[in-house]
Interface confidence: low
């Protein structure tokens, strides 16, 4: 991709639009992206559901995931599906269900810390949610070899969660929200999208 491609682009994956654009009615936690989004209204609605048809992925694979935890996963899904500002981190995926993925997106350290704090008392059975599930029933279930334990057991640090969970889609940044040098999962869209500034910063030296 050339530099202009990096600044405002949707990756080639399962549900993404081909080009970013306004989506005035994006649902709930995805609404910050409504001015310019890679997700459709339908996708934004679907990813808020407990048992979404988008990926047939069950957050509650080890019993109840607390809503405080789940809202971070919803926000993660909104960023993944809706953000047009992740161009510098798009890589070839080589998977049947998507041609591209994100790798090492520099997530603001507070976003990762808060995600980990909110989820530490919920339960899971795996360190990498991209692979190793039992899909025989059509939804993800824990394999027999993977016992349900607290998030804190499988993810002892914030970085182990944010970086390990989706096979290094994120890298925890040393920068803070508002620095212009890390990607924010959470932001107040009335102040604009802070990730637009971030992607310009990274694209400038990725293409120089």
């Amino acid at each position: 991709r050339d530099r202009t491609d990096l600044l405002n682009v949707c990756m080639d994956a399962k549900h993404h639009k081909t080009k970013p654009g306004p989506e005035d009615k994006l649902h709930d936690q995805c609404s910050p992206w409504k001015r310019n989004a890679c997700c459709s209204v339908n996708t934004s609605q679907e990813l808020h559901k407990d048992n979404s048809r988008l990926y047939n992925f069950n957050w509650d694979h080890c019993g109840e995931m607390t809503p405080a935890c789940k809202r971070h996963f919803i926000q993660d899904a909104c960023l993944y599906e809706c953000s047009p500002n992740l161009g510098p981190w798009i890589q070839q995926a080589g998977q049947s269900w998507r041609k591209e993925r994100f790798l090492d997106v520099p997530l603001c350290k507070e976003d990762c810390q808060e995600w980990w704090e909110a989820c530490r008392t919920s339960f899971t059975c795996k360190r990498d949610w991209h692979k190793g599930w039992d899909w025989t029933s059509g939804i993800n279930k824990c394999p027999d070899t993977a016992p349900c334990r607290t998030f804190q057991y499988y993810f002892p640090t914030p970085a182990s969660l944010c970086e390990g969970l989706w096979s290094h889609s994120y890298k925890v940044s040393n920068y803070s929200r508002g620095s212009g040098q890390c990607i924010q999962m959470w932001f107040d869209s009335t102040q604009g999208n802070p990730n637009e500034e971030v992607v310009k910063f990274y694209a400038s030296f990725m293409t120089s």
């Epitope: 407990d50 069950n58 509650d60 809503p67 789940k70 808060e114 909110a118 939804i139």
Partner: antibody, heavy 115, light 106 residues
Framework: QIQLVQSGPELKKPGETVKISCKAS????????MNWVKQAPGKGLKWMGW????????TYTDDFKGRFAFSLETSASTAYLQINNLKNEDMATYFC????????WGQGTSVTVSS | QIVLTQSPAIMSASPGEKVTMTCSAS?????MHWYQQKSGTSPKRWIY???KLASGVPARFSGSGSGTSYSLTISSMEAEDAATYYC?????????FGSGTKLEIK
Amino acid sequence: QIQLVQSGPELKKPGETVKISCKASGYTFTNYGMNWVKQAPGKGLKWMGWINTYTGEPTYTDDFKGRFAFSLETSASTAYLQINNLKNEDMATYFCARKGAMDYWGQGTSVTVSS
Amino acid sequence: QIVLTQSPAIMSASPGEKVTMTCSASSSVSYMHWYQQKSGTSPKRWIYDTSKLASGVPARFSGSGSGTSYSLTISSMEAEDAATYYCQQWSSNPPTFGSGTKLEIK
């Protein structure tokens, strides 16, 4: 519009069984789990647990393990709470509430236990 | 489990008066939610994620707080606000409710 409609009041004797229904409408039933909440007369709200309407898997809090059972009739968009071997302390109003945000509640079902 | 303590248990306010009730958590929670319940009816979601008003809730209501200390405020009491208000957390399993604050109109 979204509605949760519960079955009517029940009068039972100690040792009997009661089964309360909660019929959902206005949304896709299997997209949201269902909570059950107990309110004893003049008391506060107590979460009993929930059922995953997609997988059918129930989760019970410690106080409601054993005699209590959550179940589903997915084709009818209905969740059930069954209480076996009723005791006096089970006398309460039971509410179903849509999972997570508890944004929609049933009107409640009063269960009276009297010999 | 996290214990939520509401105070006061019962309070009364005159029309137009400012009302504040509190909810204290035994451990830090990420968000607090509030439900309104009137006698003989089911609870209604009133305030969620600490400060967001549920659909149809009048703007005179507000919620605030963090950590272990949260509050619900009514800027100007009206007769229809008389009810019992429950705080609730679901930052940690199991979700728990406070014992309620009964608000009466003078």
